[in-house]
Interface confidence: low
């Protein structure tokens, strides 16, 4: 009932739960004297559904039969209209439509811990939009019983507060759940299962670490366990890795040796555990440890290059490059390197150590047999030396590499191709393909790259450190014991025309011709490898097509004699520079009087 | 009363993935059981998948069988359709629907749906 239904009341049958797709007799009557003042007979009772009217009657009571309602709630008000006046409710009465419980399916319960309570979770079935109770019951020796009950449309997992032991861990319990409503009842299939079926040890807690005399190779994880964990398992990994990889122990009783470990590795821990082999479930994994294993002495050799440079008569510029280490083959922080140069054939050697470059430069005499070694130190030791004997890289003429190319091949890579040379191509024992930025001025401090490709290749893909529309100097060596020959190219991955001519800074008259010297293009307005200047003139207020004389590149060249001109006419003279996508904008307008010879 | 709406349609090539989210309203949406459909141009509207109230039980279609997989979260009122390995005959409009009852397959026995969300698979 829905108030106090004073004037009337509203009676259900069968009841006011009914079962989904069921019909209602729904009546509304009116007590004594409760009808229209003086006009009983005008009485008109309405039945409203929610906000609805469904039905009227002239009298004091309305009978109605609903069917089709709805699962959940429906609100019936009966309310009286009298003649000139408001209508009056008189009663009202909410019908409950559900359905009976379904089958609770898949009961299973579980203790978290030896000292956890039993707790059990199972499926409800569909929603019976009624209020439906929930018994759970389990049953063990000796007898005992256990009862707990919730009363939620949403129950599915009730706590028992209880904890098995494991005194007897073969014992048999018994778990059954009942739903009851008020339209029926239902209870699971039971559950049996014995403490070791149901007990899920905590997960292992205060891992460690130790590694014996700070060595990787003598590695014991540490951990805590429940005192009847039999089983664990064991996973780990390098922290930047998303796979694992597993060990599964039996009686490890807290301790595990581990012999895979790489050195100088941050790696992350988690451990499981199981009460028995074979019957009840994982711990969840343990909180995770992460610890870094010791370094150890390096291993693998450094890849060193160097380039040489004519200083004068008696002295020359070594450089060495050298690459890091990868992380596998440094094997923990790399302190410095040691370089040692030694004059093979007076024995006198000079050792020194550098941090924080990847180069050294020093200054030699051109004279004698020179050779550095160099090798990676870090706190465990260092790694062997690479060794190689100062030479000529380029001086064998028969052993550079023929027909070299180098040709764009997608973004930011340069395809570099050649032939064998021509002396005995077995004779070749690596090529090493080398490129650096091309500046202008030979600059030394520009960054060298290298790669190194085995004797039967003919072709290397160069990607590091390669910019587009930026012009690169590339040489090719081939080595053979201590011999070397070498050719070289200009090569871009990507380019287009130069962004600006060259600027004319002088114009020289010399026995009748003239001498035009300009300043080079910027590097970055270069946009790749430039392949022609080219120079321009016409006689002054003419309008006439300019005359031009076409220049290969050289990276050094920065003048060029002309000498067909006129003497004593004015000329306008420009430049322009050229890469393989086409031609630069004007550089600067100079004008020129040639004076020449008096008639 | 339950209301649907799917999300995590769009264009993928062939052999790639999406992830189709289906969000109700409703605190009972956990005592629903959510079936996912599809229905291609000129084409009847088919039964992809359906799973349970508590996400236990899921059943699928033998043409996305090993493919495709339903899961549900309860606490955000979501279910949701992985499909991996798309193929272009999998192009459609995704639907989700609810209903109390887990033996469905007929997309006419479920109560409460979604307004669908398209989804492109390009050779």
């Known amino acids: 009932k829905i108030d106090a239904c004073k004037r009337g009341d509203v009676t259900v049958k069968p009841s006011h739960v009914i079962l989904l797709g069921s019909t209602v007799n729904i009546t509304c009557s009116l007590k004594p004297r409760q009808g229209c003042f003086h006009y009983s007979r005008r009485n008109k009772l309405i039945l409203y559904k929610f906000d609805r009217r469904i039905n009227f009657h002239h009298g004091h009571s309305l009978n109605s039969q609903v069917t089709g309602l709805p699962l959940g709630t429906t609100l019936f008000v009966c309310k009286l209209a009298c003649i000139n006046s408001d209508e009056i409710q008189i009663c009202g009465a909410e019908i409950f439509v559900g359905v009976a419980p379904e089958q609770p399916q898949n009961l299973s319960c579980i203790q978290k811990g030896e000292q956890g309570t039993v707790a059990c979770t199972w499926e409800r079935g569909r929603d019976t939009h009624l209020y439906t109770e929930y018994t759970l019951q389990l049953s063990g020796p000796k007898n005992l019983t256990w009862q707990k009950q919730c009363k939620d449309i949403y129950c599915d997992y009730l706590d028992f507060g209880i904890n098995l032991t494991p005194e007897s861990p073969e014992s048999n319990f018994t778990a059954k759940v009942t739903a009851v409503n008020s339209l029926g009842s239902s209870s699971s299939l039971p559950s049996t299962f014995t403490f070791l079926d149901i007990v899920r040890p905590l997960p292992p807690w205060d891992i460690r670490i130790k590694f014996q005399k700070a060595s990787v190779s003598r590695c014991t994880l540490y951990w805590r366990d429940e005192g009847l964990v039999l089983l664990n398992r064991l996973r780990y990994r390098p922290s930047n890795s998303r796979l694992w990889n597993m060990v599964n122990v039996t009686k490890a009783k807290g301790r595990h040796d581990l012999l895979d470990l790489k050195p100088f590795t941050e790696y992350e821990f988690q451990i499981s555990s199981k009460l028995h082999l074979y019957k009840g479930s994982w711990s969840d994994w343990s909180e995770s440890l992460r610890a870094q294993t010791p370094e150890e002495e390096p291993t693998g050799m450094l890849d060193v290059w160097y380039m040489k440079r004519h200083i004068d008569y008696s002295r020359q510029q070594i450089s060495l490059f050298w690459k890091n280490l990868s992380v596998s083959e440094a094997r923990g922080k790399i302190l410095h390197y040691q370089v040692t140069l030694q004059e093979l054939t007076g024995g006198k050697a000079m050792t020194q150590n550098i941090t924080g470059h990847t180069s050294w430069t020093t200054v030699i005499p051109r004279t004698g047999n020179w050779a550095v070694a160099v090798s990676a130190a870090n706190s465990k030791g260092s790694s062997l030396p690479t060794r190689i004997n100062i030479m000529n890289l380029c001086e064998a003429g028969l052993l550079a590499p023929r027909q070299v190319s180098a040709n764009s091949e997608g973004m930011d890579n340069i395809l570099v191709t050649w032939q064998p040379p021509r002396k005995d191509p077995s004779a070749v024992q690596e090529y090493v393909v080398e490129w650096r930025e091309l500046h202008p001025g030979g600059d030394t401090q520009v960054p060298l790259n290298w790669l190194r490709s085995r004797p039967y290749n003919v072709s290397a893909l160069i990607s590091e450190n390669i910019k587009s529309y930026i012009c690169y100097e590339i040489r090719v060596y081939a080595l053979s014991g201590d011999q070397g020959g070498c050719s070289s190219i200009l090569g871009n991955s990507k380019h287009k025309a130069p962004l600006s001519g060259p600027h004319i800074n002088a114009i020289t008259e010399e026995k009748g011709s003239i001498l035009i010297s300009w300043n080079s293009i910027p590097v970055q307005e270069q946009m790749g490898c430039l392949l022609h200047y080219r120079i321009y003139w016409k006689e002054r207020d003419s309008n006439s097509q300019p005359q031009l004389c076409e220049i290969p590149y050289r990276v050094s060249q920065n003048s060029h004699p002309i000498n067909s001109l006129q003497p004593r006419v004015t000329y306008v003279l420009w430049m322009t520079a050229l890469t393989a996508a086409g031609e630069s904008s004007h550089g600067n307008e100079r004008e020129f009087c040639l004076q020449g010879k008096a008639n | 009363q339950v209301q649907l709406e799917e999300s995590g349609g769009g264009l993928v090539q062939a052999g790639g993935s999406l992830r189709l989210s289906c969000a109700a309203s409703g605190r009972t949406f956990s005592s629903y059981v959510v079936g996912w459909f599809r229905q291609a141009p000129g084409k009847e509207r088919e039964f992809v998948g359906r799973?349970?109230?508590?996400?236990?039980?899921?059943y699928y279609a033998d043409s996305v069988e090993g493919r495709f997989t339903i899961s549900r979260d309860n606490a955000k009122n979501t279910v949701y359709l992985q499909m991996n390995s798309l193929k272009p005959e999998d192009t459609a409009v995704y639907y989700c629907?609810?209903?109390?009852?887990?033996?469905?397959?007929?997309?006419?026995?479920?109560?409460?749906w979604g307004q669908g969300t398209q989804v492109t698979v390009e050779p």
């Open positions: 629907a609810a209903d109390l009852k887990w033996e469905v397959l007929l997309s006419e026995h479920y109560e409460y």
């Open positions: 799973i349970s109230w508590s996400g236990a039980r899921t």
